[in-house]
């Protein structure tokens, strides 16, 4: 099974002297998830032609994947660390239902999909500890998530493949933006 960052003593310098919310730990954790996404994307692209498809917009309209916007304060222009940290946590919480959807979408990378899901949960906990303005963080309604999951799983095969591809691509972009922003916090 994939090892989470910090589980291996070689992985983190002086692991016991670092708070869980330290910049380095959070950075390592995000990079670990990004590595997992790369592995999942590889399997997705190998088994279907979704990665070259021009019909992404069709499927994207039916998904409400979290995305960074100027107003979120996570870009260099108009950077706002409090607003941005809330957006990162809220976005990760919103991605959880999509990561749940991915769990049955992989054959050879089943463990990797589980690792991405579990380490995202841990990352959310790390970031919640770091955030002071927790009141502004809205958690998605469990009932809304359940019905979304049912809807996604009821799609035809082509749409399911496209949805998988779009989730991975969007999650990768979201994490990369988060990584850049967290560096200045």
């Amino acid at each position: 099974a994939p090892v989470l960052p910090g589980e291996d003593s070689k992985d983190v310098a002086a692991p016991h002297s670092q708070p869980l919310t330290s910049s380095e730990r959070i950075d390592k954790h995000i990079r670990y998830i990004l590595d997992g996404i790369s592995a999942l994307r590889k399997e997705t692209c190998n088994r279907s032609n979704m990665c070259e498809s021009s019909k992404e917009a069709l499927a994207e309209n039916n998904l409400n994947l979290p995305k960074m916007a100027e107003k979120d304060g996570c870009f260099q222009s108009g950077f706002n660390e409090d607003t941005c940290l809330v957006k990162i946590i809220t976005g990760l919480l919103e991605f959880e239902v999509y990561l749940e959807y991915l769990q049955n979408r992989f054959e050879s990378s089943e463990e990797q999909a589980r690792a991405v899901q579990m380490s995202t949960k841990v990352l959310i906990q790390f970031l919640q500890k770091k955030a002071k303005n927790l009141d502004a963080i809205t958690t998605p309604e469990p009932t809304t998530n359940a019905s979304l999951l049912t809807k996604l799983q009821a799609q035809n095969q082509w749409l399911q493949d496209m949805t998988t591809h779009l989730i991975l691509r969007s999650f990768k972009e979201f994490l990369q933006s988060s990584l850049r922003a967290l560096r200045q916090m």
């Epitope: 003593s9 070689k10 992985d11 983190v12 310098a13 002086a14 692991p15 002297s17 670092q18 708070p19 330290s22 910049s23 380095e24 730990r25 950075d27 390592k28 990079r31 260099q76 222009s77 950077f79 706002n80 660390e81 409090d82 002071k132 850049r180 560096r183 200045q184 916090m185």
Partner: antibody, heavy 118, light 109 residues
Framework: EVQLLESGGGLVQPGGSLRLSCAAS????????MSWVRQAPGKGPEWVSR????????YYGDSVKGRFTISRDNSKNTLYLQMNSLRAEDTAVYYC?????WGAGDYWGQGTLVTVSS | QTVVTQEPSFSVSPGGTVTLTCGLS?????????PGWYQQTPGQAPRALIY???DRHSGVPDRFSGSISGNKAALTITGAQAEDEADYYC?????????FGGGTQLTVL
């Protein structure tokens, strides 16, 4: 062009205080975490402190913790370092620098000399 | 406390290639340590060469390159020139702080 200009250094007695300033221009100051780094005569650089872009988080090296306070005023594009209970070993050139990120590297000022001596 | 280690001194012939390394007393250097490299000549402020492992600072000649090799960060100078004779310092983010190495004195002869 990125410019960082430190000021406020000088000669101070042990136990005294000093406030350093760093005026920044040529980049979006409020989007970058900022640091103070010092270099004692004949020694290598030593990281002193960092403040996040919005000023909400501050970090300190063990040797200055509890004595130095980093702060910033984004409306004035200025970084500060309040140094209290100064010791002889704090004698150094103090540099301010932005934290590399957003696709850009870190820039350093030319430094201001702080001498702690009786 | 984790110590950042560098070779105390190194020499290279003009036109030659040299690789300086930057390690940790405990653990491996990773991209999350954001290795940075600085050059300092006598009487001058340190000058940033490389940031975030392998990004060259603006205005830095392309003979300077950064990488992570094995468990260390590395600075490679390909085709060393006389003006490259200087002290080289690496810096690593460790936890929430930044630590500098003791520096490598590079001689070009």
């Amino acid at each position: 062009e990125v410019q960082l200009l430190e000021s406020g250094g000088g000669l101070v007695q042990p136990g005294g205080s000093l406030r350093l300033s760093c005026a920044a221009s040529g980049f979006t100051f409020s989007s970058y975490a900022m640091s103070w780094v010092r270099q004692a005569p004949g020694k290598g650089p030593e990281w002193v402190s960092r403040i996040s872009a919005g000023g909400g988080s501050t970090y300190y090296g063990d040797s200055v913790k509890g004595r130095f306070t980093i702060s910033r005023d984004n409306s004035k594009n200025t970084l500060y370092l309040q140094m209290n209970s100064l010791r002889a070993e704090d004698t150094a050139v103090y540099y301010c620098a932005n934290r590399a990120g957003w696709g850009a590297g870190d820039y350093w000022g030319q430094g201001t000399l702080v001498t702690v001596s009786s | 406390q984790t110590v950042v280690t560098q070779e105390p001194s190194f020499s290279v012939s003009p036109g030659g290639t040299v690789t300086l390394t930057c390690g940790l007393s405990s653990g491996s250097v990773t991209a999350s340590n954001y290795p940075g490299w600085y050059q300092q000549t006598p009487g001058q402020a340190p000058r940033a060469l490389i940031y975030s492992t392998n990004d060259r600072h603006s205005g830095v000649p392309d003979r300077f390159s950064g990488s992570i090799s094995g468990n260390k960060a590395a600075l490679t100078i390909t085709g060393a020139q006389a003006e490259d004779e200087a002290d080289y310092y690496c810096a690593l983010d460790i936890g929430d702080i930044t630590e500098f190495g003791g520096g490598t004195q590079l001689t070009v002869l």
